[in-house]
């Protein structure tokens, strides 16, 4: 009934932008976006005791305030400051798993290894995962038709700025040994233009972070190459070393077995290299 009250009070804001309005190149706001954000917030705060006191109505107000009535190509990190603040969350700073171009495996891993956290295991990451949203300048409406594409339209769009902002804060909070899962099947295993490469790497705090450990995930069963020697991994090592953070790298040759061994570490086959 709490959710229903919230929806009733705010119905006016959720009309679609008329079809004749500006068309962007990207997909429009995810259907039932406000309801989805609120429902996810309620679910998350019920499950995570340290966030139980968070007021999901205030969280939605802050989320909405970041992009409603604003030009969707002119969003700033400052617009998201209230949401970032309300979503402040203390995760064990030595249990952070970053990822690049391999989200599903990273999430499967933290679902098993419950003491480790990806960004999407935090409240803010969970709220926005796989969602799209944007508004329109000077109207209080959400645009369900189209939203700016990062490449074709503009980079300072609501979704991109959100992920940049929340990723920066997540990286800033990390300490000790930070892990990153990288996709060994891609031509650029480490991509300087990814969120990891452009935001998170540069916001790890050298005074708190001792080591960045990369896990390079192999795609083919017969792939026995040492992908830690890949030129892009060497580039990552160079960037990290210049920031006075140590770097290490491990090949995960068989991700299926890797997950199995995380689930059952006492299995005799888990002593060999995976």
């Amino acid at each position: 009934s709490g959710l229903n009250d919230i929806f009733e009070a705010q119905k006016i804001e959720w009309h679609e932008v008329p079809r004749w309005r500006q068309q962007w190149s990207g997909p429009g706001t995810t259907k039932r976006f406000p309801e989805t954000v609120l429902a996810r917030c309620v679910k998350y705060t019920e499950i995570h005791p340290e966030m139980r006191h968070v007021d999901c109505q205030s969280v939605w107000d802050a989320f909405k305030g970041a992009f409603i009535s604003k030009h969707p190509c002119n969003i700033t990190e400052e617009d998201y400051q209230p949401l970032m603040k309300l979503g402040t969350q203390t995760v064990p700073c030595n249990k952070i798993l970053l990822w690049s171009r391999i989200k599903d495996l990273a999430h499967q891993f933290t679902q098993v290894q419950r003491d480790m956290f990806t960004l999407e295991d935090t409240l803010l990451g969970y709220l926005a995962d796989d969602l799209t949203w944007c508004g329109e300048f000077n109207t209080s409406k959400i645009n369900y038709q189209s939203c700016p594409d990062w490449r074709k339209d503009c980079s300072n769009n609501p979704v991109s700025v959100f992920w940049k902002t929340v990723s920066r804060r997540f990286a800033e909070a990390a300490c000790d040994v930070v892990h990153v899962m990288l996709n060994g099947s891609r031509s650029k295993i480490f991509d300087k233009n990814s969120t990891f490469g452009s935001v998170e790497v540069h916001n790890l705090q050298p005074e708190k972070v001792q080591t960045l450990e990369a896990w390079v995930i192999h795609g083919g069963r017969e792939d026995s190459r040492d992908l830690c020697q890949d030129p892009t991994i060497k580039e990552l090592e160079s960037i990290i070393s210049k920031r006075n953070i140590q770097f290490s790298c491990k090949n995960i040759y068989r991700p299926d077995k890797f997950l199995q061994c995380v689930k059952n570490p006492e299995d005799s086959s888990c002593t060999s290299e995976i």
């Epitope: 603040k85 402040t88 203390t90 700073c93």
Partner: antibody, heavy 121, light 110 residues
């Protein structure tokens, strides 16, 4: 110069209500979180509520304050209010408003404080 | 509820002494270092001394320093001056943007 000035304190009967004001000057009011913090006589500090209103009001409360206390803001008057209902003897305290440091690296700290206003229940 | 425990509650010192105040949090603060220290004199509002555990606030003398991370923090005054006799509070920042203050440490003249 940044200034915060509280008013509205006084003597009130248990069960009564009071509205405190915090008038701000010397800074761009909309760009900062304003926090109410209280201090019982001879005791430590305790946060009450927070508000920020770049466009609409965003506010939240300490668990114990939810339901009885309401924070609001009048941007035209550069003033933040704390409406306190169903007051109890244990609400007796000096009530301060404070401005949080600006910027994500600095949030969570209070750089500017008012002089406080005493509420006696 | 989050508890911030300061020790000692009272501390007697002479001018020139080195003074250390400890603050322990029942939960880790945000970002492992999101803790502040304030100084308060009788009848006055608190004044920010340190933020993010070890960063000196604007205008604060360098004899003040802070350290610690996670749940244990210290404030040190390397050489106490007459102006430093006051009560000191630690303040943590936590999940959901909640705040908690320590019970205070009164530094008095020996």
């Amino acid at each position: 110069e940044v200034q915060l000035l509280e008013s509205g304190g006084g003597l009130v009967q248990p069960g009564g209500s009071l509205r405190l004001s915090c008038a701000a000057s010397g800074f761009s009011f909309n760009n900062y979180w304003i926090i109410w913090i209280r201090q019982a006589p001879g005791k430590g500090l305790e946060w009450v509520a927070a508000i920020y209103s770049p466009s609409g009001d965003i506010k939240y409360y300490a668990d114990w304050a939810k339901g009885r206390f309401t924070v609001s803001k009048d941007n035209s008057k550069n003033t933040v209010y704390l409406q306190m209902n169903s007051l109890r003897a244990e609400d007796t305290a000096v009530y301060y408003c404070a401005r949080e440091l600006s910027g994500s690296s600095y949030e969570g700290y209070f750089e500017s404080w008012g002089q406080g206003t005493l509420v006696t229940v | 509820d989050i508890q911030l425990t300061q020790s000692p509650s009272t501390l007697s010192a002479s001018v020139g002494d080195r003074v250390t105040i400890t603050c322990r949090s029942s939960q880790s603060v945000y970002g492992h270092n999101w803790l502040a220290w304030y100084q308060q004199k009788p009848g006055k509002a608190p004044k920010l001394l340190m933020y993010r555990a070890s960063n000196l606030a604007s205008g604060v003398p360098s004899r003040f320093s802070g350290s610690g991370s996670g749940t244990e923090f210290t404030l040190t005054i390397s050489s106490v001056q007459p102006d430093d006799f006051a009560t000191y509070y630690c303040q943590g920042y936590y999940s959901g943007a909640s705040y908690a203050f320590g019970g205070g440490t009164k530094v008095e003249i020996k």
